[in-house]
């Protein structure tokens, strides 16, 4: 569960479960910075704009990222 009211890391918990790409509004990859020392992956869902934090170390999440970027590259001219 993410909390965006902070200048530190955003995520409270991280999930190893990939989200259904069809349910996805957007997928943000926030690089490590002076505010947060780790990469954060935040999935915004279409329903209620709910945000889910995904575990960047999870194999399933890495596969999801690959699938999403593949889908995006197909769409871009």
């Amino acid at each position: 569960v993410p909390l965006s009211r902070t200048v530190r890391c955003t995520c409270i918990s991280i999930s190893n479960q990939p989200v259904n790409p069809r349910s996805l509004e957007k997928l943000e990859i926030i690089p490590a910075s002076q505010f947060c020392p780790r990469v954060e992956i935040i999935a915004t869902m279409k329903k209620k704009g709910e945000k889910r934090c995904l575990n960047p170390e999870s194999k399933a999440i890495k596969n999801l990222l690959k699938a999403v970027s593949k889908e995006r590259s197909k769409r871009s001219p």
Epitope: V1, L3, S4, R5, T6, R8, C9, T10, C11, I12, S13, I14, S15, N16, Q17, C36, P37, R38, K48, E50, R52, C53, N55
Partner: antibody, heavy 119, light 111 residues
Amino acid sequence: QVQLVESGGGVVQPGRSHTLSCAASGFAFKNSGIHWVRQAPGKGLEWVAVISYDGSNKFYADSVKGRFTISRDNSQNTVYLQMTDLRPDDTAVYYCARDGSESEYLDYWGKGTLVTVSS
Amino acid sequence: NFMLTQPHSVSESPGKTVTISCTGSGGSIDRNYVQWYQQRPGSAPITVIYEDNQRPSGVPDRFSGSIDSSSNSASLTISGLRTDDEADYYCQSYDSINLWVFGGGTKVTVL
């Protein structure tokens, strides 16, 4: 299976400090935020605090802000609630609960530990 | 301040249906998900509904949740009421100011 076990309850004098522990097992503790929720005798549930999976974020209810501190030791799978300047109205059963990683709910709870603030 | 208000108690006979309301004030209840927790006497809470209407595995389909935006309220419905449903039930949601917010709880008595 997921298990959360609170300890450290007891009788504490007003104005004193006290620390509660929550030992976790059966899940990927290092990926999970942990909450403390309390329940005064005969009353409802009151959210107290949460700490993020890596300890970088901590949030508190207004009623305990500045007096309570939540912390965690991921090597020991344990979360702590340090309570200072305790008052009689802090008397409650204190539960720790796991943050649901896929929504804003608390998916598993411990059995609780009773803290009584009394002289 | 976002608050959730529940009736203090409801009672019904075994086999009947009971509905518990949870009314939001100071904000829109459908902005974030609503959860419902069951707390039997002397026990810790367990989740019976999450994300408005989802049931965790092991929770019977007699329990259902819904949201009514027009009345800014959530409801928990228990059908085919049984004696072991006698418990306190709490709604809970999330608010960016107050963070995790609980309703005051509703005592369900099976007559």
